[in-house]
């Protein structure tokens, strides 16, 4: 289905530039560039520049976060679960019964049996079966830190409900820590949220596996339904491949701009508003690194005789198992601009303007 | 560059099915389907089914969240900022000075001037310039709710730092509420996090615009740098288009499965492991709705004479301003499976297996 032709890089760039011309006008809902007849002389007002910079800061702060998914994310994760240590265990006696907290402990040897190496853990969730709740309740989750100290993890606002419902807390980082350390028993605390003014908060929510007195009675609904950790991890035997096989490359600017990759990759393209689009109406910035995606994503026939070799290519060339994989943007970033409408300078943010990485999809 | 041909739907489906065959084996790092010679007779053990169901629950709970981006997100957002009411305003006198909190109030008439309709607001951030901080501090943000009551919004763990740094809190929902209500002054409270045991927490962090005594002195660094709301909104004159023009469709199963859309859309494809792949080794599920993306994404020449008509098409057909837009998956969901390795049943989660929506990219 795929016909090979040599790519006219200049034509592709031209088409990308022309598409950007339409995209910017379309995003601003302008049929044509705005008239510049009313623009006052001199630089932009300081307040406008400050606002433009605030917007740029926001973009900078955000774009640093989403990393391209690591190679390991492509591969299957084995799912296991580790039930909470039963409440008649002596560990619970060390923690005073309290109206504002319940305690949940886990045996780390069971965790290590399920996930032998911290690096193999992909996700860990603490699952609690919440029984009916009469009033709204704000709860907080803590992790046991040292002997009797607790570290805040997250919070949740629970709406009143007549029926039981599973609650899930992402505790991946915590479980990874536990797997790295030598402790035998580790735990969580679920507490009522106490603000600095009102301190008489009681934990109203009933969690399956605890009586109202915050202890025992695992038969509340079913022993299997007591709190547990749901673990998703790369099996040990599969992890060897991850180290040994060639890693799935992030097709981002770091890799693509410094390589001669022929297949799908992000390609460098700087748009100078004045030179490339003949536009003088955008006051800031003067241009931007739009970039674009280009390169083949070969369809892989899984019935190929070289089966194991072929399968190794899926991750890079057709991870989504498409009938016709295509090289498209993965990570995109917004672009703030300053321009005048009549005498009024405007700061506007245009979404998804800068291509940071590509993928076969 | 685009040559029109009639699409052989059956060939596309066949290629998608074959790609899925390779994808699943590749994700499990198997060169061929596992031998079933050790599988014991009868159904899966109850504990394995419970684990599989837990994994399915997780998927169900998650997939409900990420909505395809609304049409408005494509268009440019005007950026404005509204500074905090200066601290010599009498509103501050109503709130007792405290060691654990600072208060920030905003004039809603200024907010309404910037964003006349709540629906136009795309994002609102509370920006605070944090001065140097000696110790780690856990802070909480509250919104003024009624006369003297405060509603918890979010929290942040602030690391020690020698240099000033901007903090940003997403308060879109709150500001949207304020725009809908009739109040004149609305506010936030930044407090130290108090747990139910230790209640002597002091707010250690210094926010520009407040003295250590938690009042006044706006010149700490710069008046413009006192707390402010950064607003991103669709301008009123542009909003009319949003209502009047045909909305950007979410190319998801709801729309695509019930329409005769010729252009890019998600197409229905159920994979029965036994019938389509000849596989009997996956115990659960028996099959799944893989779906696939298909349909043209026409390249739009923005130099076209019918300029305003052409621009309206960008949002649907080439929102990323690609030189060769392509119909690809947008929202994907994972698939948990149960299969045997020898005598051992395994529950594994395969990422990005189900196509829920498509986009031109």
């Amino acid at each position: 289905l795929s016909t090979c032709k040599t790519i006219d890089m200049e034509l592709v760039k031209r088409k990308r530039i022309e598409a950007i011309r339409g995209q910017i006008l379309s995003k601003l809902r302008l049929a044509s560039p705005p008239s510049q007849g009313e623009v006052p002389p001199g630089p932009l007002p300081e307040a406008v520049l400050a606002l433009y910079n605030s917007t740029r800061d926001r973009v900078a702060g955000e774009s640093a976060e989403p990393e391209p998914e690591p190679e390991a994310d492509y591969y299957a994760k084995e799912v296991t679960r580790v039930l909470m240590v039963e409440t008649h265990n002596e560990i619970y006696d060390k923690f005073k019964q309290s109206t504002h907290s319940i305690y949940m402990f886990f045996n780390t040897s069971e965790l290590r049996e399920a996930v032998p190496e911290p690096v193999l853990l992909s996700r860990a969730e603490l699952r609690l079966l919440r029984l009916k709740l009469k009033v709204e309740q704000h709860v907080e989750l803590y992790q046991k830190y040292s002997n009797n100290s607790w570290r805040y993890l997250s919070n949740r606002l629970l709406a009143p409900s007549d029926s039981p419902e599973w609650l899930s807390f992402d505790v991946t980082g915590v479980v990874r820590q536990w797997l790295s350390r030598g402790g035998e028993i580790e735990g969580f605390r679920l507490s009522a949220h106490c603000s600095c003014d009102s301190r008489d908060n009681t934990l109203q929510v009933d969690i399956n596996g605890f009586t109202t007195g915050r202890r025992g009675d695992l038969a509340t609904i079913h022993g299997m339904n007591r709190p547990f950790l749901l673990l998703m991890a790369t099996p040990l035997e599969r992890a060897q491949h991850l180290q040994s096989s060639r890693h799935r490359r992030a097709l981002d600017t770091n890799y693509c701009f410094s390589s001669t990759e022929k297949n799908c990759c992000v390609r460098q393209l700087y748009i100078d508003f004045r030179k490339d689009l003949g536009w003088k109406w955008i006051h800031e910035p003067k241009g931007y690194h739009a970039n674009f995606c280009l390169g083949p994503c070969p369809y892989i026939w899984s019935l190929d005789t070289q089966y194991s070799k072929v399968l190794a290519l899926y991750n890079q060339h057709n991870p989504g198992a498409s009938a016709a994989p295509c090289c498209v943007p993965q990570a995109l970033e917004p672009l703030p601009i300053v321009y005048y409408v009549g005498r009024k300078p405007k700061v506007e943010q245009l979404s998804n303007m800068i291509v940071r990485s590509c993928k076969c999809s | 560059l685009s040559t029109c041909k009639t699409i052989d739907m059956e060939l596309v489906k066949r290629k998608r099915i074959e790609a899925i065959r390779g994808q699943i084996l590749s994700k499990l790092r198997l060169a061929s389907p596992p031998s079933q010679g050790e599988v014991p007779p009868g159904p899966l053990p109850e504990a394995v089914l419970a684990l599989y169901n837990s994994t399915r629950d997780r998927v169900a709970g998650e997939s409900a969240e990420p909505e395809p981006e609304p049409e408005a997100d494509y268009y440019a957002k005007e950026v404005t900022r509204v500074l905090m009411v200066e601290t010599h305003n009498e509103i501050y006198d109503k709130f007792k000075q405290s060691t654990h909190s600072i208060y920030m109030f905003f004039n809603t008439s200024e907010l309404r001037e910037a964003v006349p309709e709540p629906v136009l607001l795309s994002r609102a951030e509370l920006r605070l310039l944090r001065l140097k901080l000696k110790v780690e501090q856990h802070v909480e943000l509250y919104q003024k709710y009624s006369n003297n009551s405060w509603r918890y919004l979010s929290n942040r763990l602030l690391a020690p730092s020698d240099s000033p740094e901007w903090l940003s809190f997403d308060v879109t929902g709150v500001v949207r509420q304020w725009l809908s209500r009739g109040g004149e002054i609305e506010g936030f409270r930044l407090s130290a996090h108090c747990s139910c045991d230790s209640r002597d927490n002091t707010l250690q962090v210094d926010i520009n615009g407040f003295t250590t005594g938690r009042r006044g002195d706006l010149a700490t660094i710069h008046g413009m740098n006192r707390p402010f709301l950064l607003l991103m909104a669709t301008p009123l004159e542009r909003a009319q288009h949003l209502q009047s023009s045909r909305h950007r469709r979410a190319l998801d199963t709801n729309y695509c499965f019930s329409s005769t859309e010729k252009n890019c859309c998600v197409r229905q494809l159920y994979i029965d492991f036994r019938k389509d792949l000849g596989w009997k080794w996956i115990h659960e599920p028996k099959g799944y709705h893989a779906n696939f993306c298909l349909g043209p994404c026409p390249y739009i020449w923005s130099l076209d004479t019918q300029y305003s008509k052409v621009l309206a098409l960008y949002n649907q057909h080439n929102p990323g301003a690609s030189a060769a837009p392509c119909c690809v998956p947008q929202a994907l969901e994972p698939l948990p499976i149960v299969y045997y390795v020898g005598r051992k049943p395994k529950v594994e989660q395969l990422s990005n297996m189900i196509v829920r929506s498509c986009k031109c990219s």
């Epitope: - | 031998s35 079933q36 050790e38 599988v39 014991p40 007779p41 009868g42 159904p43 899966l44 020898g342």
Partner: antibody, heavy 121, light 107 residues
Amino acid sequence: EVQLLESGGGLVQPGGSLRLSCAASGFTFSSYAMSWVRQAPGKGLEWVSAISGSGGSTYYADSVKGRFTISRDNSKNTLYLQMNSLRAEDTAVYYCARVDSSGGYWYFDLWGRGTLVTVSS
Amino acid sequence: DIQMTQSPSSLSASVGDRVTITCRASQSISSYLNWYQQKPGKAPKLLIYAASSLQSGVPSRFSGSGSGTDFTLTISSLQPEDFATYYCQQSYSTPLTFGGGTKLEIK
């Protein structure tokens, strides 16, 4: 050609022993669980025993437990049934059957022609 | 042990008839049920597995249905070569057990 061929049947006295063999060909023998099913003259089918692909797991009907032993030699593509303490009610045609155990459904998708075992004094 | 009861034990029908044989399990076996055909002097042959899946090479006039305790084998239009004895078999748990059989004869 994919096939199963039983041998070793015959006449034996009550309390005696017999060893049945089943030679497999045309498929990857070690990838399949295997089974023995018997049919008394003019009666219905009765499952006797089964063994996993590696030989690591064995299963027996209550009526033969402790008297019959199932085994396999994957290097020779052969399945065995060692029958001790034979009784008159063990008289039957013994079929060797390949088990497709996919999904735990355990169905017999390939059968041999059978070998007759007669227990009589 | 799980008992399998087939009915009827024998049945007379003509070529072209639609025939239904039922099989009942003494407890729920989900869809862990298989059907076989046996002709005199021959080994049994697999027709249906997992209650409703047609084994490859078996004519489409054969179909299976049911779940839990009640199952049926249906032959939509009897052909001369279909006169034989039919057995159901459960694989929900060991010991694996067969039904007593249904003998289908020419009327």
